[in-house]
Amino acid sequence: GSVKVLHEPSCFSDYISTSVCQWKMDHPTNCSAELRLSYQLDFMGSENHTCVPENREDSVCVCSMPIDDAVEADVYQLDLWAGQQLLWSGSFQPSKHVKPRTPGNLTVHPNISHTWLLMWTNPYPTENHLHSELTYMVNVSNDNDPEDFKVYNVTYMGPTLRLAASTLKSGASYSARVRAWAQTYNSTWSDWSPSTTWLNYYEPWEQHLGKPIPNPLLGLDSTGLNDIFEAQKIEWHEHHHHHHHH
């Protein structure tokens, strides 16, 4: 029978090395065997390149195309082929369809004044246009209470978020994940980062540690502060361990 495209290709670029196009066929298709997506930069001397699509679902195909470091003027001509039959033809401008890379290495650290410091890495090298354009959304959720979740918008430059432990339930396990977008490029959101999980043991700090904590932490040097956090982490670890085994 004839091969038809049900939903034409939708493409996004990470604006550094890769563009991804996805489309849906009108029936289950072996994408890599039956289809090819050709792409060519609209630039003098540019060669034609071919992308072999993979199946995302029975009838959904996805093609990941290596591109050079994108610039605003870049426009690609795309042609979807089934053998000698041209199924679809269109153009794609990466700068107008940006989906940032996923932020990486999300970690949670205890910080001064009963706060948690969430840190992650900017997925772009400093020389890339997007490095300084990203803002982030951090989602913090209680692993045991679906209604206990918070969303934080990080619109300043640094990939960090300070979170007061008192805003979270004491003794609860929390997970955080982060995603990025680039406002000036009117991008879509990136995929969420993998989650990182930690135990929030906030109240009462004094009883739990068995000694008072100066507040504010006046006269306490960083070594003393580290000792407190190490002790706190050990207690948390033991509690968590105990919790999981009994």
């Epitope: 630039f43 003098m44 001397g45 540019s46 060669e47 034609n48 390149h49 050079d68 610039v71």
Partner: antibody, heavy 125, light 112 residues
Framework: EVQLVESGGDLVKPGGSLRLSCVAS????????MTWVRQAPGKGLQWVSL????????YYADAVKGRFTISRDNAKNTLYLQMNSLRAEDTAVYYC??????????????????WGQGTLVTVSS | DIVMTQTPLSLSVSPGETASISCRSS???????????LDWYLQKPGQSPQGLIY???KRASGVPDRFSGSGSGTDFTLRISRVEANDTGVYYC?????????FGQGTKLEIK
Amino acid sequence: EVQLVESGGDLVKPGGSLRLSCVASGFTFRDYAMTWVRQAPGKGLQWVSLISGSGGKTYYADAVKGRFTISRDNAKNTLYLQMNSLRAEDTAVYYCAVDRLTKTIRPQYYGLWVWGQGTLVTVSS
Amino acid sequence: DIVMTQTPLSLSVSPGETASISCRSSQSLLYSIGYNYLDWYLQKPGQSPQGLIYLGSKRASGVPDRFSGSGSGTDFTLRISRVEANDTGVYYCMQGLQSPNTFGQGTKLEIK
């Protein structure tokens, strides 16, 4: 050493045909676009045609479109210009030159960084 | 087609002086930041042309730093400082952005 050597220039009558060759050495020929430029006696330079590294893309000046055909044989490191329906105004020295690197998605541009010595084409009755 | 216009068409300069040649394009040659597809070539008497400057300001291999290119968009300049007798010839600008690539009319540099 990067080198280009043209040949095939000759005296030909109007309406006649001629094929120019340009043999390249000293660089990875298939990775680069190649260009033909001509210069009529006592005149300036005129861009004629470009072909991408694989030979898949070709471009022509309006003055030669439909009459000239650029091609290449990457196995022989040779560039060609097939010239048909020649006119008196095609009389010129024809130079081949190495153009942009086209094996990358966006060609890397260095200008016309090496030129041949040229071959003279004279169209006259 | 993009039209390239050079000025002046001829120039006479004494050795040691600076020569400046202007090239103007009918459309912008700026593709992206820092990438102006404008070249400068020199054709010495009886020789093939040779590349001097590409992408507006980058010197070709082996070209002395006396030769410098500047400009962006539609207005470009080639400067030759401390001119030598060996710099005699015809200088051409060329746009490499759009097909057909096009040359300026050429500027003849004469050393006094």
